[in-house]
């Protein structure tokens, strides 16, 4: 650690005195202190001499000697008072700049330690300090306003009592800056804009920050626009607003608009797109397939995306048949607006009944006309099966009718014994009917197919089963010949009821 001579913590001298401060260290040493005049510095290896032969009140301050090469960063200090009866204060700063909630040191150094008892801090022109100003004083350093607030940005003077009267220092301006958390907050409205050529449009770019020092501008396709700025202050924030008013838009006004704001913390920007169109438009689309298939009893949401300008004047969902004249319940239709020009309309169809298959149309209207988008909804059903014994062209025939959607395929099984359903162990014979005859196939209805199995003689201790299946499920019917005639068995679990 360097050593200062004279080896006292404080030195009190009169104006005009010669002062010599010597610092000795192991290596080279350096002096630091208040910015003050009339000192001469002379370094000689490991010692450095600071001297003045005409000390003034401005030399009052703490002089510190450091050894740059010392890894521990040791230093020694001496405080010099130049006791001037006419100048009780040496003010080291014209202005003090701190951030909110930092301590603000107002560097009024007392030139005579005896005066410490009668010091006070005031605002200029003798005004008292603001309420809740918490401060302390050190004769070596000055007044510290603790946890300074923005509102305490004022001009201050240090006051000392000399011979019964108050002597003021020159003023110190305190600037308490708001802590700027980041670049200014931005809004650009609207987020998107569409206008027909000749209409009026307005784009508003606004930025706000806790600090007034920020810039904001609006640019169109990378060209900065010259727009008068409106400034405001509310909710403890500074606001700057740029409003672009276009009385009659044309195609050259279209394009990308960016609102850009910057401060010392950085830059924020946000963009929007302005479309200029020749005339009104209305486009309907769906991400879904317009042909829908759903299993009976399940639910379905039909969604339509609408892109329109100007806004819609009307819209509705309509059921176009074929089963009934019922219309979708309004409570099952809802609309959500994605943004100004795009909307999604949803029709919810829960627990679909057979009578609800068919065509659903969404209709919308705006000044550009009306448009419709139609969905076709077909219900899927598991097969229903029935078997009868009949004679066709004199031959005994088992006739199986299967009804479902999608079209069922049919398999015949012959098995030993009397049973409701053939199991693998009992099966004697299997016939697949790849091309059953289609009896009915209307849109939105079940498909009914018929399969014939010609049987010369019915074996009495056997069961004939017709099985039908599709992507939804399967159904079967067991036919058991008995002496008194034929006997049929639908399986226990049948029938399906939606």
């Amino acid at each position: 650690i360097p050593v200062i001579e004279p080896s006292v913590p404080e030195l009190v001298v009169k104006p005009g005195a010669t002062v010599t401060l010597r610092c000795v260290g192991n290596g080279s040493v350096e002096w630091d202190g208040p910015p003050s005049p009339h000192w001469t510095l002379y370094s000689d290896g490991s010692s450095s001499i600071l001297s003045t032969n005409n000390a003034t009140f401005q030399n009052t301050g703490t002089y510190r000697c450091t050894e740059p090469g010392d890894p521990l960063g040791g230093s020694a200090a001496i405080h010099l008072y130049v006791k001037d009866p006419a100048r009780p204060w040496n003010v080291l700063a014209q202005e003090v700049v701190v951030f909110e909630d930092q301590d603000a040191l107002l560097p009024c150094l007392l030139t005579d330690p005896v005066l410490e008892a009668g010091v006070s801090l005031v605002r200029v022109r003798g005004r008292p300090l603001m309420r809740h100003t918490n401060y302390s004083f050190s004769p070596w350093h000055g007044f510290t306003i603790h946890r300074a607030k923005f509102i305490q940005s004022q001009d201050y003077q240090c006051s000392a009592l000399m011979g019964g009267r108050k002597v003021m220092s020159i003023s110190i301006r305190l600037k308490v800056q708001k802590v700027i958390p980041g670049p200014p907050a931005l809004t650009l409205v609207p987020a998107e804009l569409v206008r027909i050529r000749g209409e009026a449009a307005q784009i508003v770019c606004s930025a706000s920050s806790v600090d007034v020092n920020f810039d904001v501008f609006l640019q169109h396709n990378n060209t900065k626009l010259a727009i008068p700025q409106q400034s405001d202050f509310h909710n403890n924030r500074y606001q700057k607003v740029l409003t672009l008013n276009l009385d009659q838009v044309d195609f050259q006004h279209a394009g990308n608009y960016s609102c850009v704001a910057s401060n010392v913390q950085g830059k924020h920007s946000t963009s929007m797109f302005f479309r200029v169109v020749e005339s009104a438009y209305l486009n309907l689309s769906s991400e879904q397939n317009l042909i829908q298939e759903v299993t009976v009893g399940e639910g379905l949401n039909l969604k339509v995306m609408v892109e329109a300008y100007p806004g819609l004047q009307g819209f509705n969902w309509t059921y176009l048949g074929p089963f009934s004249d019922h219309q979708p319940e309004p409570k099952l239709a809802n609309a959500t607006t994605k943004d100004t020009y795009r909307h999604t309309f949803t029709l919810s169809l829960p627990r679909l009944k057979p009578s609800e298959a068919g065509r659903y149309s969404f209709l919308a209207r705006n000044p550009g006309g009306w448009r419709a988008l139609t969905f076709e909804l077909t219900l899927r059903y598991p097969p229903e099966v029935s078997v009868i014994w009949t004679f066709i062209n004199g031959s005994g025939t088992l006739l199986c009718a299967a009804s479902g959607y999608p079209q069922p395929n049919v398999t015949w099984l012959q098995c030993s014994g009397h049973t409701d359903r053939c199991d693998e162990a009992q099966v004697l014979q299997v016939w697949d009917d790849p091309y059953p005859e289609v009896l009915s196939q209307e849109p939105f209805h079940k498909v009914t197919v018929q399969s014939l199995l010609t049987v010369e003689t019915l074996e009495h201790n056997q069961t004939y089963e017709c099985r039908a299946h599709n992507s939804v499920g399967s159904g079967s019917w067991a036919f058991i010949p008995i002496s008194a005639g034929a006997h049929t068995h639908p399986p226990d679990e049948f029938l399906f009821t939606p």
Partner: antibody, heavy 118, light 110 residues
Framework: QVQLQESGPGLVKPSETLSLTCTVS????????WSWIRQSAGKGLEWIGH???????NYNPSLKSRVTMSVDTSKNQFSLKLSSVTAADTAVYYC????????????WGQGTLVTVSS | QSVLTQPPSASGTPGQRVTISCSGS????????VNWYQQLPGTAPKLLIY???QRPSGVPDRFSGSKSGTSASLAISGLQSEDEADYYC???????????FGGGTKLTVL
């Protein structure tokens, strides 16, 4: 070894505010005075002002009404704001460490040219 | 117009001794110490002399400074081609309450 680096826009419009930041590396910003000095073809080297790490500032009287300096010890940075600029403020701006008592500048940034033009 | 006055140019041949003067007033050089800076082309100024005649480490002893009254001078002995630069004097000014600079002297090594 202490190093200083100026940063900020190279072009400022007349009447706007010039803002520069100096980042100190290789040493602590604490317990020193930090200065801004500018050099223009017409006026040579001109001291703008200095700031101590406590926030104490002194400015050149000719610029005092337009200057604000601040320091952020947590970032090892100090900054300069010069408002209402004119073409006369076009210069190379340097930040430097100021040694007080006998005032001299022992470390300098490389300088940044700021042009004031519309 | 700079507060401290320097000749705009000076020159010398390699090996020669060159002196650059700096003139001020009682409020600056007359009552405070003088510093000298060297500015090589395209670079920032570099401290050459502080407190009238003190050399920072790394500065060759060919450079020396002196002060008398309200004037100061920088002497460069054994001139070398790499000494071609602009040289500025500076001093604290009591009336300004801050440092002032000279207008600079362009040294050419012939």
């Amino acid at each position: 070894q202490v190093q200083l680096q100026e940063s900020g826009p190279g072009l400022v419009k007349p009447s706007e505010t010039l803002s520069l930041t100096c980042t100190v590396s290789g040493g602590s910003i604490s317990s020193y005075y930090w200065s801004w000095i500018r050099q223009s073809a017409g006026k040579g080297l001109e001291w703008i002002g200095h700031i101590y790490t406590s926030g104490s500032t002194n400015y050149n009287p000719s610029l005092k009404s337009r200057v604000t300096m601040s320091v952020d010890t947590s970032k090892n940075q100090f900054s300069l704001k010069l408002s209402s600029v004119t073409a006369a403020d076009t210069a190379v701006y340097y930040c430097a460490r100021e040694r007080t008592v006998v005032t001299y500048f022992d470390y300098w940034g490389q300088g940044t040219l700021v042009t004031v033009s519309s | 117009q700079s507060v401290l006055t320097q000749p705009p140019s000076a020159s010398g041949t390699p090996g020669q001794r060159v002196t650059i003067s700096c003139s001020g007033s009682s409020s600056n050089i007359g009552s405070n110490t003088v510093n000298w800076y060297q500015q090589l082309p395209g670079t920032a100024p570099k401290l050459l002399i502080y407190s009238n005649n003190q050399r920072p480490s790394g500065v060759p002893d060919r450079f020396s400074g002196s002060k008398s009254g309200t004037s100061a001078s920088l002497a460069i002995s054994g001139l070398q081609s790499e000494d071609e630069a602009d040289y500025y004097c500076a001093a604290w000014d009591d009336s300004l309450n801050g440092p002032v600079f000279g207008g600079g002297t362009k040294l050419t090594v012939l």
